[in-house]
Interface confidence: low
């Protein structure tokens, strides 16, 4: 009886009709940059204020007839999806609409820029509560549009945009490619990526998450009580704008970085059939479908992390790729990946006062990706400790020697074109968890962080026989901060984090005999923050009987490490 | 925005001295870049967003826009300033011939110029 899309974004064990109160999102204002809208539609009447902003190009074609219902169609539907009485996500959110798309759904980059500037000026003149800006539009990659989005985001505005309906890499489009914007792809009732005619939803590393975007029932501009089904990444973005409004209404102080991390954290994981995406995009595309959090509060104690992939380095010998975290995030680890396996590892380095993750291509390689693990860790003080290649045959090792610093990630980088296999694999001595080890010809980089209550442990999973993929996951209550492979030999394609699982990929089994050089160990560093837990508990009071602290005390950490001896 | 097409004579006279001086010459070695949409059918040649360096004030943006108009007028080109940006990015939106791009890229404070392009409802 309730539309599938509203059911889908409701957390398990909750009923959508009871979960979405009539004032959900009421502290938030959502700006919609789209077509004109039918503001007296029953779904949105009294909820949407039509601003006097209009900047649209002339319609194409001499025989074009301006028909009000057609002109208003796209915007009216989206306003309904965000805040409609019946079919809306955030039924209490108030909206303001700006007309930047004409009756054919076409606008300009310049018109959109002027619209964004209008929002910024409105915000300065009359500061209100949290602002969400919905951009259900896309054009080709635009440096200036991305820059404007970045500035608005840095002014505290949450921007949500459509990934695009071109069945293509979202990084080729704007504003979808702007890192500060929350970019949303579309999935259907079967959690499949949405196909739209011969095209479909965009994908790739510039997409933050997916949301319902096919057969979405919402307000139709044909009459004031009409409803219609529409599909597209605009509809998906409207769902996320609504979810963002709900979250911000519950926690108005959330920063953009915190909101993005929560959107990712509360999403349904690994439900999308990746076979729909081109093979080279599967690893880059997040397998996440947006959902509302199970309760409005209580997420604050968790250590939130996300994985950020760089652009592809390109194939030149000295090519590098750089992955960056958002300004409010900490880079806790850095890894790399190459489909050909030809890479020279990765390193964390300072750039403009912030750590970035840089991956290095190798001669004959088709290029590499850098993969950053970006986390929310307030009051963190992180540094990188480096050990040059070791002289001895034991391999290189580096540890966190400063008092109170814990190891959050390990990276290794080598200058030689091909690392020889390294037998036997280096075993970490018991009782020394705070150290990274690697190949003797590689320099090793340890990410060492001090933050109140931060504790980490190392978890390994080794496979003696060659296997294309080795994984190790952090258990409930712990967050994956670091993911790397032991040893860093040439048949390892790389390592990367998927949600809370560390994935190490190796060359096709058939190319690496079954000798010990096929052996691979995936190394995960799992962390949690007792400080965040305590702060959250203080905020909520001790209403829950036994507090989180007691739970943590009962689970005193033991530094268990399972060492796999390969024969 | 009022039509400024009739103001060239006055602008040329007013800006001649400023233009000939080196007070606001672009810094040595920093060249502004030009960008346009990779998807040809979506390009909108003839309209350009001139983005100025980050700390540029509104008055400098307006002065740079007038300077472009004056220099264009001296070369016999009509231009129209459609919008002056401030608040998010400093710069201006100008309707002009693509022939003037080389000239515009050499203006003081210019960071980059982007040709306007289409966006579409998704």
């Amino acid at each position: 009886s309730i539309p599938w899309n509203l059911e889908r974004i409701t957390p398990p064990r909750y009923r959508a009709d009871e979960y979405q109160p009539p004032d959900g999102g009421s502290l938030v204002e959502v700006y919609l940059l789209d077509t004109s809208i039918q503001s007296d539609h029953r779904e949105i009447e009294g909820r949407v204020m039509v601003t006097d902003f209009e900047n649209v190009p002339e319609e194409d074609g001499t025989r074009f007839h301006r028909q009000a219902s057609k002109c208003d169609s796209h915007g009216t539907h989206l306003a309904g999806v965000v805040s409609g009485r019946d079919a809306g996500v955030a039924k209490g959110a108030s909206m303001r609409s700006l007309r930047v798309l004409n009756c054919q759904g076409k606008g300009t980059v310049s018109g959109t820029l002027i619209g964004l500037e209008f929002i910024r000026k409105s915000q300065l003149v009359q500061p209100v509560g949290p602002l969400v800006v919905l951009l259900p539009l896309a054009g080709g990659y635009s440096r200036v549009l991305n820059a404007a989005c970045q500035r608005l985001a840095r002014a505290g505005v949450v921007l949500v945009t459509a990934a695009g309906n071109f069945r293509d890499d979202a990084c080729l489009y704007s504003p979808a490619s702007a890192p500060e914007v929350i970019t949303v792809g579309a999935t259907n009732a079967q959690d499949q990526p949405v196909t739209l005619g011969t095209l479909g939803t965009n994908f790739g590393r510039c997409v933050d998450l997916f949301a319902p975007g096919e057969d979405i029932i919402g307000a139709s501009s044909d009459c004031s009580t009409c409803f219609v089904s529409q599909s597209g990444t605009s509809q998906a973005a409207a769902h996320v704008a609504g979810i963002a409004a709900m979250m911000l209404s519950a926690e108005p102080e959330l920063t953009l970085a915190e909101l993005r991390q929560r959107l990712i954290h509360f999403s349904a994981k690994d439900v999308i059939n990746e076979a729909w995406f081109p093979e080279d995009q599967r690893v880059l595309t997040p397998n996440l479908v947006a959902a509302l959090p199970p309760s409005t509060h209580g997420a604050g104690w968790q250590l939130f992390c996300r994985t950020v992939w760089s652009a592809h380095s390109g194939p030149t010998r000295m090519a590098t790729a750089v992955a960056r975290c958002a300004p409010d995030e900490e880079l806790l680890s850095c890894s790399s990946f190459s489909r050909s396996g030809k890479r020279r590892g990765e390193r964390m380095e300072a750039q403009g006062g912030k750590l970035v993750c840089r991956a290095h291509n190798a001669f004959g390689g088709e290029g590499v990706y850098a993969i950053a693990r970006c986390c929310l860790l307030p009051q963190a003080n992180c540094s990188v400790h480096t050990a040059p290649p070791a002289e001895a045959s034991m391999g290189t090792r580096v540890h966190c020697h400063q008092q109170g610093h814990v190891l959050t990630g390990c990276s290794s980088h080598w200058e030689v074109e091909d690392l020889g296999t390294h037998k036997p694999p280096v075993l970490r001595p018991r009782g020394q968890p705070n150290q990274c080890v690697g190949h003797r010809e590689a320099s090793i980089h340890a990410s060492c962080c001090h933050a109140p209550g931060l504790e980490c442990k190392v978890k390994e999973h080794g496979i003696p026989a060659p296997q294309e993929q080795v994984t190790v996951a952090c258990e409930e209550g712990w967050t994956l901060t670091g993911c790397s492979a032991l040893p860093g030999t040439s048949h390892v394609l790389g390592a990367y984090a998927v949600d809370n699982t560390c994935v190490v990929r190796s060359r096709d089994v058939s190319t690496t005999g079954s000798t010990s050089e096929g052996a691979v160990t995936a190394v995960a560093i799992c962390c949690r923050s007792r400080h965040l837990a305590q702060a959250s508990q203080e905020l909520q009071g001790s209403t829950s009987g036994s507090g989180l602290n007691d739970i943590f005390e009962a689970q005193k950490i033991e530094w268990h490490e399972h060492h796999h001896h390969h024969h | 925005q009022e039509d400024e097409d009739g103001d060239y004579e006055e602008l040329v006279l007013a800006l001649r001295s400023e233009e000939d001086g080196l007070a606001e010459a672009p810094e040595h070695g920093t060249t502004a870049t030009f960008h346009r949409c990779a998807k040809d059918p979506w390009r909108l040649p003839g309209t350009y967003v001139v983005v100025l360096k980050e700390e540029t004030h509104l008055s400098q943006s307006e002065r740079t826009a007038r300077r472009l108009q004056a220099q264009a007028a001296r070369r016999g080109y009509l231009t129209k300033i459609l919008h002056v940006f401030h608040g998010l990015l400093p710069g201006f939106l100008v309707k002009m011939s693509g022939d003037l791009l080389e000239l515009a890229l050499k203006l003081p404070h210019v960071d980059y110029i982007e040709e306007d392009s289409s966006v579409f409802a998704q």
Epitope: P3, E18, S26, L27, G46, D86, A87, T225, F227, S249 | -
Partner: antibody, heavy 121, light 112 residues
Amino acid sequence: QVQLVQSGAEVKKPGASVKVSCKASGYTFNDYWMHWVRQAPGQGLEWMGYINPSSGFTKYHQNFKDRVTMTRDTSISTAYMELSRLRSDDTAVYYCARQYDYDEDWYFDVWGQGTTVTVSS
Amino acid sequence: DIQMTQSPSSLSASVGDRVTITCKSSQSLLNSRTRKNFLAWYQQKPGKAPKLLIYWASTRESGVPDRFSGSGSGTDFTLTISSLQPEDFATYYCKQSFNLFTFGQGTKLEIK
């Protein structure tokens, strides 16, 4: 004038279904949600759910979710409530009531006269 | 679900008396966007359908005599009849519409 006229009394056996109608007149049917409320003998009022005639969307109280179906026929401005797998404790007066479809008007300003449904073997 | 608790469940009074019925909700009914309390009061006479008296906690429905008034905000609400008339003897229900709809159990007002 505005009125909601409900169908007549019904006597049903346990396990059967009942379908009650509510015909609206004197106003634009699509502009108001139609709610159904029941009242067992000597008891209070119990909200069952609603239908939005313009969209056909329904929301049901969880106590009835598996057994109730609300529908409408906009061509004759009539709403229907069907309750299946009847039990003796479903014996009650069933009311339809309208609510203006506007987010500040969450109250029922016009009610039907009620339909008595008796479930007895 | 939001629970609605009315008190008293019954009361006896005489014509001309001032009568107060209270209603408590298990969570706030104040809609933060509209600044309105989503609470209504209904009157029901035997064998009849309920009739709307008050909505938004304190707004009288048109045609309802001004001796009926509603007050309160958040979780505590009151229906007051300033001077009882013979036709006022009935059962009164409060109802929340903040999240779906729930009625109070009713207050039966009888002649003393």
